[in-house]
């Protein structure tokens, strides 16, 4: 709020802009007939220092010269970088109550001369872009600093642009607004940046470049692909490019991939044939361009073209398995199962499967198509049967896979030995076995089959299986394996026309069951008690149950209970015990045991055996 210096003037020596570390003299002079009205000798001039509008110092003690009542000179030192405001005020000492009156003020800027600009870098984006250069300005000057970018080319042609840096904006890039045409490819250009402020000037070293050094082609555009004769593996990639491009780089990958296929194409003229694509696969394609084989810069990658290659007929063979169930004396139900082809084998959307069941002597053939991965038929129990399945998409069908239908567990001599199941981790079970001891025909393959031991699993859920070569005696099963669930695992040994199997239960992780079995009845028959129970609900078993335990003790007794341990069998739900005294009341209960421990006890039942009738 300085009133335009009516009372006097303030001047600075050597200048209002000084280098860091320099001192300055500030003189405050009153105009004629200004000052304290009655006693000019009582005029006292004071100098106040403000930083960011905040009073920081009264420079009363820094007077170096004084013309009483007319002017005073103050020396200021140790000024910080940036701007500092000094205000001269008049203090009429005879009137203590009146505040000092502002006379005039001055701003002093402290800064440094600019350093020579460095690291000049110029670029022209595309053949029709303009040349823009950037540079490193060096240390902040704290003063308004002007930068001039000057470009010189052939025939003494010159072009320049200017900008400035201050405390609000930074100038380290300029667009010259000039475009270099490709016919200057061999020409050399020189660019330099000059910096000037009130404390000095400096100039960069000249930076020399050619057209090829700075022109970055625009990324290719309008990318498309044409599949030859609707082929899923061959396609012509096409795009638009700037006229001077001589080299392209193509990269492409399936969308779920993490590594690109890279191709360099010279003089492609916007067209390139690809021959190694995977049918029915989502691909991403990108292209980059360069104006010179050896020099110059690559363009940015183009926008992605995402497209799916066409289908081709399926390849590979289906993995088939089956289940046989006798219905009555002359009929059996055959359930065929197969695994979906993986995408690289399916090579398209599988529309249906062609299933054939054939009696080997060709008397009977059953054929059908299905969209499912299973098929069930009732056939006679007589005759030798074979099954085949093939997968079809819009372009054709895979070669059929054949399997002989044999009695899977019919030959004891083919049963694998010493089958074991060990939990590997939360979702794996390692199954091992020994080959059949006295097989009268060679084992062609082993099938490891598993399904959860839960009610209705045979009818509700298809089996899971793995095919194992005949020289392998182990399998790590992981598909659909969940912790705390018991699985029935069968190892089948198959020859050309026979099958043998062994069964075991296994889990990938176990805990003690949540509860014990529920005793439903206790009956007495011929001096033996029969304990009947219901099995623990499936979710509460928490793994494979190894044994049940039946506990009993005399009512009100504090003695340890007696117990009987029973090997777990799913089909068993009663057991006899015979060591109870007649006409003594007993309390009975049951628990279940997994590899992790014993469950809490189930319900308690009281029973008093009657013994022999008199």
């Amino acid at each position: 709020n300085i009133d335009v210096c009516k009372l006097g003037t303030v001047t600075v020596q050597p200048a209002p802009v000084i280098p860091l570390g320099s001192a300055a003299n500030i003189s405050c002079s009153l105009n004629p007939k200004q000052g304290c009205s009655h006693y000019p000798s009582s005029n006292e001039l004071i100098l106040l220092k403000f930083v960011n509008d905040v009073l920081v110092e009264n420079l009363h003690g820094k007077k170096v010269h004084d013309h009483t009542g007319h002017s005073s000179t103050f020396q200021v030192t140790n000024l910080s970088l940036g701007m500092t405001l000094f205000v001269c005020k008049l203090n009429c000492s005879n009137s203590q109550k009146k505040p000092p009156v502002p006379v005039c003020g001055v701003e002093i800027s402290v800064g440094v001369a600019p350093e020579p600009p460095q690291n000049i870098s110029c670029v022209q984006e595309g053949e029709n872009g303009t040349v823009a250069c950037s540079w490193n300005s060096g240390k902040v000057t704290y003063l308004k600093t002007n930068y001039t970018l000057q470009l010189s080319g052939p025939n003494n042609l010159t072009c320049q642009k200017q900008c400035f840096s201050d405390n609000r904006q930074n100038c380290n890039r300029l667009d010259l607004g000039i475009n270099l045409s490709p016919d200057l490819a061999e020409s050399r250009f020189i660019v330099r940046v000059t910096a000037i402020n009130d404390l000095g000037n400096s100039s960069s070293l000249p930076h020399t470049f050619t057209f090829l050094d700075i022109v970055i082609p625009l990324p290719p555009w309008d990318i498309r692909i044409n599949f030859l004769n609707a082929s899923g593996s061959r396609g012509t990639l096409q795009w638009e490019d700037e006229g001077q491009v001589v080299l392209n780089q193509l990269r492409y990958q399936p969308l779920n991939s993490t590594s690109w296929n890279m191709v360099n194409a010279t003089n492609a003229k916007g067209k390139y044939d690809l021959r190694d694509l995977r049918p029915f696969t989502e691909y991403e394609f990108q292209i980059s361009s360069k104006l010179h084989l050896s020099g110059g810069s690559w363009s940015n990658w183009s926008e992605s073209l995402r497209t799916r290659t066409p289908e081709e007929e399926p390849v590979g063979i289906l993995d088939i398995w089956y289940m046989k169930q006798d219905i009555d004396y002359d009929r059996q139900q055959i359930s065929l199962f197969w695994k979906s082809l993986n995408p690289s084998e399916a090579r398209g959307k599988i529309l249906h499967y062609q299933v054939t069941l054939q009696e080997v002597t060709k008397k009977t053939t059953l054929q059908n198509t299905t969209r499912h991965t299973s098929w069930t038929r009732v056939i006679p129990r007589t005759g030798a049967w074979t099954a085949s399945v093939s997968a079809a998409n819009s372009k054709g069908a895979s070669a059929p896979t054949h399997i002989n239908i044999v009695d899977l567990c019919g030959t004891g001599l083919l049963a694998p030995h010493q089958v074991s199941a060990k939990s590997e981790n939360m979702d794996n079970i390692l199954v091992t076995w020994q080959p059949p001891k006295k097989a009268d025909s060679a084992v062609r393959e082993y099938i490891v089959e598993w399904r959860a031991l839960q009610p209705g699993s045979i009818t509700k859920f298809p089996p899971h299986w793995l095919r194992i070569p005949p020289d392998n005696m182990s399998a790590l099963i992981s598909e659909n394996i969940k912790p705390y669930i018991c699985y029935e695992i069968r190892v089948h040994a198959l020859s050309e026309s026979q099958g043998g199997c062994s069964s075991i239960r296994g889990d990938s992780k176990h805990k003690a069951p949540v509860s014990g079995p529920h005793i439903t009845a206790i009956t007495e028959k011929k001096e033996r008690l029969f304990i009947s129970w219901t099995h623990i609900p499936f979710p509460e078993q928490r793994g494979c149950i190894l044994h049940y335990r039946i506990y009993w003790k005399e009512r009100d007794s504090t003695a340890q209970p007696e117990l009987c341990e029973i090997q777990y069998r799913r089909s068993q739900n009663s057991h006899p015990i015979s060591s109870l005294q007649p006409r003594v009341t007993y309390v009975l209960w049951m628990t279940a045991v997994t590899a992790a421990g014993e469950s809490p006890q189930g319900n308690e039942r009281e029973f008093c055996p009657q013994g022999k009738a008199n």
Partner: nanobody, 127 residues
Amino acid sequence: QVQLQESGGGVVQPGGSLRLSCAASGYTFSNHHMGWFRQAPGKEREGVAAIYTGAGNIYYADSVKDRFTISKDTAKNTLYLQMNSLTPEDTGMYYCAADLTRWYSGGWRDPRGYKYWGQGTQVTVSS
């Protein structure tokens, strides 16, 4: 919108003089290349003289050096070409061009590089 308007052409005897003017509207002279071109019947347009207002550089074709002088009056936004010692070879349509935005190997002489053009003024040198 930028408009360039040439004037000052006419018929003159060999050895005579003419002063061409190019008045610019919608355009400021600061930091731009401006030039004079001519085109004789059946020939390509050729650069005669140019001035770079940003740095004060002045360029002349060899054929007119020491005879022609290019200058500008920033206050009047006008470009001039003073032509002395005219010869019949100087006959043609003279055009004013402004804003060299594309550099070709011909530099300031290449007419393809300029963004704005006037309609032209005819100069005929004949006895």
